[in-house]
Interface confidence: low
């Protein structure tokens, strides 16, 4: 028969023959022949291959370096890589999470819109009219101005995005 020019799924072409690819978690030891099937071997400890492949070496699991603020989120298997995340209070510098940076605080006049996670930084938002934040914080939202009316008081000093309103007693002479 004519030698094949293309192979089926999960096969590869070598020496005019279609050989089976090794399954995920295994590496190639030797190609198939006319008489023998592809020889594969399981990946060793701390190694993986996540696709049907003809690789002669497995990939090393990612190392979550604690010196870079990383810790293991999900341990790797022979078919999956280790997933790293950042220590509490830090977040990844990239999607691959190769190192971490400190969560940042929102300055006075800004509140936390979204608290930081292991993969995303703190998201700050300016305090809108009627709200304020007087601290630099990585977790505090903008607080609403005090309602003087509900306390039977009047506004003596207007609030800003950084300060609360100041309430005071009503001037009874002008009531």
């Amino acid at each position: 028969p004519e030698p094949p020019t293309a192979c089926r799924e999960k096969q590869y072409l070598i020496n005019s023959q279609c050989c089976s690819l090794c399954q995920p978690g295994q590496k190639l030891v030797s190609d198939c022949t006319e008489f023998t099937e592809t020889e594969c071997l399981p990946c060793g400890e701390s190694e993986f291959l996540d696709t049907w492949n003809r690789e002669t070496h497995c990939h090393q699991h990612k190392y979550c370096d604690p010196n870079l603020g990383l810790r293991v989120q999900q341990k790797g298997t022979s078919e999956t890589d280790t997933i790293c995340t950042c220590e509490e209070g830090w977040h990844c510098t990239s999607e691959a999470c190769e190192s971490c940076v400190l969560h940042r605080s929102c300055s006075p006049g800004f509140g936390v819109k979204q608290i930081a996670t292991g993969v995303s930084d703190t998201i700050c938002e300016p305090c809108p009219v009627g709200f304020f934040s007087n601290v630099s914080s990585a977790f505090e939202k903008c607080h609403p101005w005090t309602s003087c009316e509900t306390k039977d008081l009047v506004v003596q000093q207007a609030g800003t995005n950084k300060t609360d309103v100041v309430c005071g007693p009503q001037d009874r002479l002008r009531a």
């Epitope: 870079l68 603020g69 400190l102 300055s107 800004f110 914080s137």
Partner: antibody, heavy 120, light 112 residues
Framework: QVQLVESGGGVVQPGRSLRLSCAAS????????MHWVRQAPGKGLEWVAV????????YYANSVKGRFTISRDNSKNTLYLQINSLRAEDTAVYYC?????????????WGQGILVTVSS | DIVMTQSPLSLPVTPGEPASISCRSS???????????LDWYLQKPGQSPQLLIY???NRASGVPDRFSGSGSGTDFTLKISRVEAEDVGVYYC?????????FGPGTKVDIK
């Protein structure tokens, strides 16, 4: 205004321990990341350690890892640096510094520094 | 670790003239949010360091506008448009992107 005052320095024999303190005022201490930085006589600045605002995360320079411990007491507005097994190369002025947070990343206010001399 | 280098290490200046200091990082300090996590500090003789520039190009509060920072990624420059006598001291760059945070070796600026 922001004020950081270091204390606890002095002359110490090699191999001994020392605890430096940094008293903070003029800002909400518990909301800020804090650093220690040191400077050997006639040399440049060397970053030593950092601690998150709530004390849950701490990181160190490779040169001090295992011997130095950074800690804080937010109720006392105080940052600490415990130095064990002191060596001659630890002789330096030690500064505590506040991190400016998201708006101003990195140390934005520094203390006046405290001298630690390691000598027999 | 990110290694920081500065040049020159010594810079004699003439009052009224411009001055420029270069800082280079061994890997990019440009974060995905578009900011460069690089600060500049001045340590005047006998004093603690003071923050001049943060996030690569932002002047810290109270810093005169003759100081400016520029650059991105791995190459940064601190410029003084017209040097004054009070500007003498050692200038340091520092990366604050990832731990361990690291300083450059410093540039000593003095009057000619």
């Amino acid at each position: 205004q922001v004020q950081l005052v270091e204390s606890g320095g002095g002359v110490v024999q090699p191999g001994r321990s020392l605890r430096l303190s940094c008293a903070a005022s003029g800002f909400t201490f518990s909301s800020y990341v804090m650093h220690w930085v040191r400077q050997a006589p006639g040399k440049g600045l060397e970053w030593v350690a950092v601690m998150s605002y709530d004390g849950s995360s701490k990181y160190y320079a490779n040169s001090v890892k295992g011997r130095f411990t950074i800690s804080r007491d937010n109720s006392k507005n105080t940052l600490y640096l415990q130095i064990n097994s002191l060596r001659a190369e630890d002789t330096a002025v030690y500064y505590c510094a506040r991190d400016g947070g998201k708006a101003v990343p990195g140390p934005d206010y520094w203390g006046q520094g405290i001298l630690v001399t390691v000598s027999s | 670790d990110i290694v920081m280098t500065q040049s020159p290490l010594s810079l004699p200046v003439t009052p009224g003239e411009p001055a420029s200091i270069s800082c280079r990082s061994s890997q990019s300090v440009l974060y995905s949010n578009g900011y460069n996590y690089l600060d500049w500090y001045l340590q005047k003789p006998g004093q603690s360091p003071q923050l001049l520039i943060y996030l690569g190009s932002n002047r810290a509060s109270g810093v005169p506008d003759r100081f400016s920072g520029s650059g991105s990624g791995t190459d940064f420059t601190l410029k003084i448009s017209r040097v004054e006598a009070e500007d003498v001291g050692v200038y340091y760059c520092m990366q604050v992107l990832q731990t361990p945070f690291t300083f450059g070796p410093g540039t000593k600026v003095d009057i000619k």
